[in-house]
């Protein structure tokens, strides 16, 4: 199945010459970025990117690795060191603080320097760090958050919240002692810390009082409002803006995104996280690509530009379950959103970054034949005379012993969307990994994204590119905001 043209050295020489020609034409833009987009693939380590690239190709009946993801087309790439101040291997809270605020923090804290301590409310005040999104808003730009998780989840919360515990989604999750000390839940901070123009994702239940039925699952008490303070945060948010609109399903979203009277849009499409792309009801819930498009339609109306955070948040969840099928199909939808955003924006005035907050203990190996299914088996057998998959996890729930031995696996089993790849160590949930992750960049000042950098560098590149604090004297032309 090897393409015959690939046996000829001319094929590779010609391909490389074309790539070299394109590289030679790259000119670092000396202009400021009017718009900033950061695409965050939660848990999207390099092994995930590679495997997703192959899957995307195989879904188009290609062999796989020769395919280009949308993110592969970005001309500048760096490596990001993801450790948090207190852990070699971080969580999504500490990493969000790094790439969105430009300061490293401690494990499971958000929007706080490392002087703050996990779960200790009294260490919050005075240790807040300000996100690039907040700085963009202060500079007159429109701002938005789009995610497939709940909008109060760790990664998006890094854009607007300051909390010593990433799990404080609603006030029901905050201990009474912390509430008395003045620590606010993340949902409250979502609507009160700053003015966010577009909020799209999951997380309805954290916005409504306990006992409020969910509009999609009205009979299911477990999906209804969770708030103990009796507040309807959606109502409070709507009251703040004349042109604010709240939607909870795909149809309403598509209508609102085209309505010129809508200036602020909140769309919460599930009580908690949104469903995996492979489980999504396409009439009720929008895809990440559709949410991204809707956000861009609204945000791009501002002549001063915008800041947009787009998260493929459930790549991480698929990996935690040791279900590579879920993680990789989420990665492909994330890449589709990147592609669509590229069609709706210009690299002349928009700096787009794609990165991950951390990796996972997810591996791809075993010398599989070119063109063989990414979910398939490695050639030959392991030392226990059993088959093994090319995708594996270092730890996680895929660890199973049957009669004291590792179970055999067939191609049909491993290709199932529900299959959990095997792991060396049994855990309820597979863990993050500590290796560096990629940062892809395109647009004004993208050339700054190079080498091996601290994860905090990402926030600083965005701030500098758009001449935001602390780089208002960035000396780039045209200066940010001159287009209005």
């Amino acid at each position: 199945i090897i393409p015959v043209e690939e046996e000829n050295p001319d094929f590779w020489n010609r391909q490389a010459a074309e790539a070299l020609g394109a590289a030679k034409k790259l000119q670092p833009a000396q202009t400021a970025a009017k718009n900033l987009i950061i695409f965050l693939g939660d848990g999207m380590g390099v092994s995930t990117v590679t495997a997703a690239r192959i899957l995307k190709g195989q879904k188009k009946d290609k062999l796989g690795p020769e395919t280009f993801l949308a993110m592969d087309r970005f001309p500048y790439v760096a490596l990001s060191k993801t450790y948090s101040v207190d852990k070699h291997v971080p969580d999504s809270g500490a990493t969000a603080t790094a790439y969105l605020c430009g300061v490293k923090g401690n494990f499971q804290t958000i929007g706080l320097s490392a002087a703050a301590r996990f779960n200790q409310c009294n260490t919050t005040r005075g240790n807040e760090v300000i996100s690039v999104m907040n700085r963009a808003k202060k500079a007159g730009k429109s701002v938005g958050v789009v995610t497939t998780t709940r909008v109060q989840h760790a990664s998006p919360a890094g854009a607007y919240a300051h909390t010593v515990n990433r799990n404080w989604y609603s006030d029901a999750d905050v201990p009474a002692s912390a509430r008395q000390e003045g620590c606010q839940d993340i949902a409250t901070q979502l609507i009160s810390n700053m003015d966010i123009d577009v909020i799209l994702g999951g997380g309805r239940k954290y916005m409504f009082p306990m006992g409020t039925p969910d509009p999609e699952y009205p009979d299911d008490y477990s999906q209804g409002g969770t708030r103990l303070d009796g507040k309807n945060l959606v109502q409070e948010w709507l009251a703040k803006h004349q042109g604010a609109r709240y939607v909870w399903n795909r149809t309403e979203l598509l209508q609102a995104s085209l309505d010129p009277s809508v200036t602020h849009l909140m769309g919460l499409f599930e009580p908690g996280d949104m469903k995996y792309e492979i489980h999504r009801d396409s009439t009720l819930d929008p895809s990440l690509m559709e949410m991204t498009e809707a956000a861009l339609l609204l945000l791009s109306r501002n002549p001063r530009g915008f800041f947009l955070f787009v998260e493929g948040g459930r790549i991480d969840h698929g990996h935690h379950e040791s279900r590579a099928y879920r993680a990789l199909t989420e990665t492909i939808m994330f890449d589709d959103a990147i592609e669509r955003a590229g069609q709706l924006t210009s690299e002349e005035d928009t700096l787009s970054l794609v990165t991950a907050d951390h990796s996972h203990v997810f591996s791809f190996g075993g010398y599989p034949l070119r063109g063989s299914s990414i979910f398939g088996l490695a050639p030959g057998k392991a030392r226990d005379r059993k088959a093994y998959t090319v995708l594996l996890y270092g730890n996680g729930p895929g660890y199973v012993l049957k009669d004291g031995a590792r179970p055999d696996v067939t191609e049909s089993e491993s290709g199932s969307p529900e299959y959990r790849q095997q792991s060396a160590v049994p855990l309820d949930g597979e863990t993050h990994a500590g290796e560096d992750v990629a940062v892809f960049a395109r647009g004004p000042q993208a050339h700054l994204v190079h080498g091996v950098q601290e994860q905090t560098f990402i926030a600083h590149v965005m701030a500098f590119a758009a001449c935001l604090e602390p780089y208002t004297a960035c000396d780039l032309a045209p200066r940010a905001g001159t287009t209005d």
């Epitope: 489980h279 379950e321 529900e418």
Partner: antibody, heavy 123, light 106 residues
Framework: EVQLVESGGGLVQPGRSLRLSCTAS????????MSWFRQAPGKGLEWLAL??????????EYSASVKGRFTISRDNSKSIAYLQMNSLKTEDTAVYYC??????????????WGQGTLVTVSS | DTQMTQSPSSLSASVGDRVTITCKAS??????IAWYQQKPGKAPKLLIH???TLQPGVPSRFSGSGSGRDYTFTISSLQPEDIATYYC????????FGQGTKLEIK
């Protein structure tokens, strides 16, 4: 409102074939996994076959007890799931149920069931 | 394939009694277990999914717990209308039912 209605059951001789239909309404058919189960008289419930949704390429799975004899399929334009049963045996006598998965907590739990259709295999 | 061992196969209890049914999986099913109630001539009715989440409209006397391979279904105070056969179902890896527990009133 989600509704599943099975049809096609009846009396059939051993060795013959039968096709069961499950007509679905009240939801976006292509977005959901569909499955067939059966229950022999006085016995427990047994899963037979599953067909996944559009996003996963309508792939299929079968229990070892029916693999090779039974085939699950779907006609998305009509919102119908089928179970083609070949080489029927007397032990295939049962009430056959069609079900739809719901993705709660990311698991494919069976929240919706049809009323069942009785298949009797006898000479 | 994942096997489910349900016990007891039958049980007799009085109105108001606390009733417990257990299911043991042949491997870790990661909390992907559901409990169904079936009455004669009817389709199974979902009571609980993901180990402990009650379906809409199901009385709070029904509950579930467990993790790993071991799971429990409890009726805190048996009512006459609870007379039925109860099944556990694992849905972590395809689907497997337990053998069922026939519940009768003393």
């Amino acid at each position: 409102e989600v509704q599943l209605v099975e049809s096609g059951g009846g009396l059939v001789q051993p060795g013959r074939s039968l096709r069961l239909s499950c007509t679905a309404s009240g939801f976006t058919f292509t977005d959901y996994y569909m499955s067939w189960f059966r229950q022999a008289p006085g016995k427990g419930l047994e899963w037979l076959a599953l067909i996944r949704n559009k996003a996963t390429g309508y792939t299929t799975e079968y229990s070892a007890s029916v693999k090779g004899r039974f085939t699950i399929s779907r006609d998305n334009s009509k919102s119908i799931a089928y179970l083609q049963m070949n080489s029927l045996k007397t032990e295939d006598t049962a009430v056959y149920y069609c079900t739809r998965a719901s993705f709660y907590y990311d698991g494919k739990v069976l929240a919706y069931w049809g009323q069942g259709t009785l298949v009797t295999v006898s000479s | 394939d994942t096997q489910m061992t349900q016990s007891p196969s039958s049980l007799s209890a009085s109105v108001g009694d606390r009733v417990t049914i257990t299911c043991k999986a042949s491997q870790d099913i990661n909390k992907y277990i559901a409990w169904y109630q079936q009455k004669p001539g009817k389709a199974p009715k979902l009571l609980i999914h993901y180990t402990s989440t009650l379906q809409p409209g199901v009385p709070s006397r029904f509950s579930g717990s467990g993790s790993g391979r071991d799971y429990t279904f409890t009726i805190s105070s048996l009512q006459p209308e609870d007379i039925a056969t109860y099944y556990c179902l694992q849905y972590d890896n395809l689907y497997t039912f337990g053998q069922g527990t026939k519940l009768e009133i003393k």
